[in-house]
């Protein structure tokens, strides 16, 4: 039975050319986290594997950095980076938990962080 919840950084915005940290946190479960995937739509950005550590997809190596923790740092942001990002927690015995973050990359210097929210 899946009892956990994922808290994410929610809806966030950042400036073009800047960087942003995507963060998810799995709570309320004692399940083992065996792997965390970070995805943009259906593209795999990075994996944090409990045995192997981090693997960054080759096409994102220049602009994606692991961490902090199980989070992911996106650098040199462009307007094309606007969209949905997903953290996918592979756990045992619970199964798969998914959190969603919406990132808006702004041309202007006005970039405010959205409120935190929970995904059941």
């Amino acid at each position: 039975m899946m009892t956990g919840t994922i808290e994410t950084t929610g809806n966030i915005s950042a400036e073009k050319g800047g960087s942003i940290i995507l963060q998810c946190h799995l709570s309320s479960t004692t399940a083992q986290v065996t792997q965390v995937n970070w995805e943009q739509q259906d593209q795999l950005l990075a994996i944090c594997n409990a045995d192997l550590g981090w693997h960054i997809s080759p096409s994102f190596k220049d602009r994606v950095a692991p961490g902090p923790g199980l989070g992911l740092t996106l650098q040199s942001l462009t307007v094309n980076d606007t969209g949905e990002y997903f953290c996918i927690y592979h756990t045992y015995p619970d199964g798969t938990y998914t959190g969603r973050i919406f990132l808006e990359v702004l041309e202007s210097s006005v970039a405010e962080h959205g409120a935190r929210f929970q995904i059941p």
């Epitope: 995937n37 994996i47 045995d51 199964g95 798969t96 998914t98």
Partner: antibody, heavy 119, light 107 residues
Framework: EVMLVESGGGLVKPGGSLRLSCAAS????????MSWVRQTPEKRLEWVAT????????HYPDSVQGRFTISRDNAKNTLYLQMSSLRSEDTAMYFC????????????WGQGTSVTVSS | DIQMNQSPSSLSASLGDTITITCHAS??????LSWYQQKPGNITKLLIY???NLHTGVPSRFSGSGSGTGFTLTISSLQPEDIATYYC?????????FGGGTKLEIK
């Protein structure tokens, strides 16, 4: 070319033991999660065991927990399944399979080794 | 355990036809569904992962759709090499479970 070749199957009496092997080639074995899946004589597929890339995490369904042991030797590029206290319902074709890096699905399968448990 | 109910169990179609196989999960599995093809000689191949993503090297006549509890595999313009048994599998929770299979034959 990714290749997975199972061996070690055979005829065994109820209560007996058997050790299956899966020789992997054509990819960096030590970076992939691996599983054993079996196919019953009625052609139903059943997940049997999963082991993480470094062997730290191992998962089984209740039906084989305590009787089967999955292991791997990354230096030999080989996956194992030690089966003990075998029952007639364990009769099946046993496949080893590799999981996609994202753990979405099993992207390569061997052709299987047959296990028959009968007196 | 999550039950995966696959239908039909067998299917006969003509070359060039479009066929659909369905898989129903007993509880929500989001998009964590894969489709496999098994040919005689126990040659098993991944076709679709995450409900709709075509695996590398799989012809574009194969497509998958669905989320939650209902999923479909569609094969358009059926070819002789598509004669096989097709299985769905859920990756949402443990134990991993499979559908009962659909045996596809050519008329």
């Amino acid at each position: 070319e990714v290749m997975l070749v199972e061996s070690g199957g055979g005829l065994v009496k109820p209560g007996g033991s058997l050790r299956l092997s899966c020789a992997a080639s054509g990819f960096t074995f030590s970076t992939y999660v691996m599983s054993w899946v079996r196919q019953t004589p009625e052609k139903r597929l059943e997940w049997v065991a999963t082991i993480s890339s470094g062997g730290s995490y191992i998962h089984y369904p209740d039906s084989v927990q305590g009787r089967f042991t999955i292991s791997r030797d990354n230096a030999k590029n080989t996956l194992y399944l030690q089966m003990s206290s075998l029952r007639s319902e364990d009769t099946a074709m046993y496949f080893c399979a590799r999981w996609l890096l994202g753990l979405y699905a099993m992207d390569y399968w061997g052709q299987g080794t047959s296990v028959t448990v009968s007196s | 355990d999550i039950q995966m109910n696959q239908s039909p169990s067998s299917l006969s179609a003509s070359l060039g036809d479009t066929i659909t196989i369905t898989c129903h999960a007993s509880q929500n599995i989001n998009v964590w569904l894969s489709w496999y093809q098994q040919k005689p000689g126990n040659i098993t191949k991944l076709l679709i992962y995450k409900a709709s993503n075509l695996h590398t090297g799989v012809p574009s006549r194969f497509s998958g759709s669905g989320s939650g509890t209902g999923f479909t595999l569609t094969i358009s313009s059926l070819q002789p090499e598509d004669i096989a048994t097709y299985y769905c599998q859920q990756g949402q929770s443990y134990p991993r479970t499979f559908g009962g299979g659909t045996k596809l034959e050519i008329k």
